[in-house]
């Protein structure tokens, strides 16, 4: 903490301007009135303060707003945003997308993923749902940031907004997030024709259940291996060799290259070797001929 001193009369601050860059830390602490700082926050970013000086300014704002900064201050934080921790941001209530844009621009090129994730979370909470304007802002200013939201927050996305989401926006989404987004995408694209539907649904398929993957195998979609590898393991394991062959079409030969990677490896172990041999790819590790497969999980479920 900055030690308290009295402000020398000649150093008294009546407005936030460039002269403050010559103030020592203790002088800033003693001479800058927090309310004045808050009122003139729009000037701060244009002044080349050192990181040490910014620490003092943050400290002043923290004292003035212990419950969290108002949006009028947040909007003009500029480089002061780089000093904020996720704990600081959690106290905020942000509704303006202009505020979000301004802070996303500042954070670019800095290691601030936790802060940005918390900021986006606060915006979604402040606006009540993840609406189209918010999604558009995220995709434009922070590709991949959509996936920083929790599944609970993503559940507030209306299906009508899904069309604004691009494949690269989903690149960092985990299975739980795709579990939430997939049914919304399915609903959003349900009236499209087969090939157009597949192009649109492809980035969301990491959340698809087995029955939907089986259905796709009947539609000559020729799924590429990159998409197949992103499917849930649980969705892939029940597929038969014939279904996988239909699903992948000409891409089926890629199974050989990926045979050591999950979910391909796990799927191979569940297939009869005879069936795998029909693919002519030299896939090994299937269940040998003459072996009986006992599904003990069924018995356990009944007992």
């Amino acid at each position: 903490d900055v030690e308290r001193t009295t402000c020398p009369p000649e150093k008294e601050v009546h407005e936030i301007d460039e002269s403050l860059i010559f103030y020592k830390k203790r002088e800033l602490e003693a001479c800058v009135d927090a309310a004045l700082l808050a009122a003139q926050m729009d000037r701060v970013d244009a002044i080349p303060f050192t990181y040490e000086q910014l620490d003092v300014l943050k400290h002043k704002l923290d004292e003035l707003y212990p419950q969290g900064y108002p949006e009028s201050v947040i909007r003009h934080l500029g480089h002061l945003f780089l000093k904020m921790s996720p704990e600081d941001i959690r106290k905020w209530n942000v509704t303006s997308l202009e505020t979000l844009k301004a802070l996303l621009k500042v954070s670019k090129g800095h290691e601030m993923s936790a802060q940005v994730a918390t900021l986006i979370d606060r915006v979604v909470v402040g606006r009540g749902q993840l609406d189209k304007d918010t999604v558009d802002t995220l995709t434009a200013f922070c590709p991949g940031c959509l996936c920083s939201l929790s599944p609970e927050r993503l559940s507030s996305v209306p299906p009508s907004v899904i069309g604004a989401v691009r494949p690269q926006d989903l690149d960092t989404c985990g299975p739980r997030q795709l579990d939430v987004l997939y049914p919304k995408a399915r609903l959003a694209f349900q009236n499209m024709s087969g090939s157009e539907y597949f192009v649109k649904i492809r980035p969301f398929l990491g959340g698809a259940p087995t029955e939907d993957v089986k259905a796709l195998s009947q539609q000559n979609v020729s799924m590429d291996l990159a998409t197949f590898m992103k499917l849930r393991r649980e969705a892939v394991l029940p597929l038969t060799v014939a279904e996988v062959q239909k699903l992948l079409g000409p891409h089926v030969e890629g199974l050989k290259v990926e045979e050591q990677h999950s979910p391909v490896r796990d799927w191979i172990l569940k297939q009869r070797q005879d069936d795998l041999d029909t693919l002519g790819l030299g896939l090994q590790g299937g269940i040998p001929n003459g072996y009986l497969i006992l599904d003990l999980s069924v018995r356990e479920a009944l007992s």
Partner: antibody, heavy 119, light 108 residues
Framework: EVQLVQSGAEVKKPGASVKVSCKAS????????MDWVRQAPGQGLEWMGD????????IYNQKFNGRVTMTEDKSTSTVYMELSSLRSEDTAVYYC????????????WGQGTTVTVSS | EIVLTQSPDFQSVTPKEKVTITCSAS???????LSWYQQKPDQSPKLLIY???NLASGVPSRFSGSGSGTDFTLTINSLEAEDAATYYC?????????FGGGTKVEIK
């Protein structure tokens, strides 16, 4: 433009570890595996293993098992290759190379990172 | 593991001449799973041919590939000065992936 940019040259002592990074840009990071290939001075190419950035799943050449670890960071589209218990024979140029999932050929290569192991 | 043996190890050729490099596998390779790379001094390797005979993007048509089973060939129809490099075959038909020992082509 598709690019793979690797970290700079390293000089290490025997027994130490080295971690090389490879930052990808210009394409969908999770649609391609990243493989690592090394080349000892005046020698040919040797495949070390690969990582699927989508799942984080790895396959290593058994020759390096226990010594090599490949990891990824989707948020920065970066993959890492760490080789431990270094010996003089590990002196080589280490390349990351992009491989479309479902194919086995490397269509884009990093510029290479020279690792020198010397006491 | 599949061992790929290239021959010759070294070839000194005059411009416009035809160059043939062979790659012999210790066991059968699915032809979809063989490729060729070109590496010039102090440069990273560059993909030339994939799936035995498909030319990679931007590769001149004087390069071609053929073969099946255990024997594969890279041909440069009319050698140019810029083709001086080391050429490697590569298989991904079985783990671990392997490369041939390389063939160095020098311009006379």
């Amino acid at each position: 433009e598709v690019q793979l940019v690797q970290s700079g040259a390293e000089v290490k002592k025997p027994g130490a570890s080295v971690k090389v990074s490879c930052k990808a840009s210009g394409y969908t990071f999770t649609d391609y595996n990243m493989d690592w290939v090394r080349q000892a001075p005046g020698q040919g190419l040797e495949w070390m293993g690969d990582i699927n950035p989508s799942t984080g799943g790895t396959i290593y050449n058994q020759k390096f098992n226990g010594r090599v670890t490949m990891t990824e960071d989707k948020s920065t589209s970066t993959v890492y290759m760490e080789l431990s218990s270094l010996r003089s024979e590990d002196t080589a140029v280490y390349y990351c190379a992009r491989r479309r999932i479902g194919t086995g050929y490397f269509d884009v290569w990093g510029q290479g990172t020279t690792v020198t192991v010397s006491s | 593991e599949i061992v790929l043996t290239q021959s010759p190890d070294f070839q000194s050729v005059t411009p416009k001449e035809k160059v043939t490099i062979t790659c012999s596998a210790s066991s059968s390779v699915i032809s979809s799973y063989l490729s060729w790379y070109q590496q010039k001094p102090d440069q990273s390797p560059k993909l030339l041919i994939y799936r035995t005979s498909n030319l990679a993007s931007g590769v001149p048509s004087r390069f071609s590939g053929s073969g099946s089973g255990t024997d594969f060939t890279l041909t440069i129809n009319s050698l140019e000065a810029e083709d001086a490099a080391t050429y490697y075959c590569h298989q991904w038909s079985s783990f671990p992936y392997t490369f041939g020992g390389g063939t160095k082509v020098e311009i006379k």
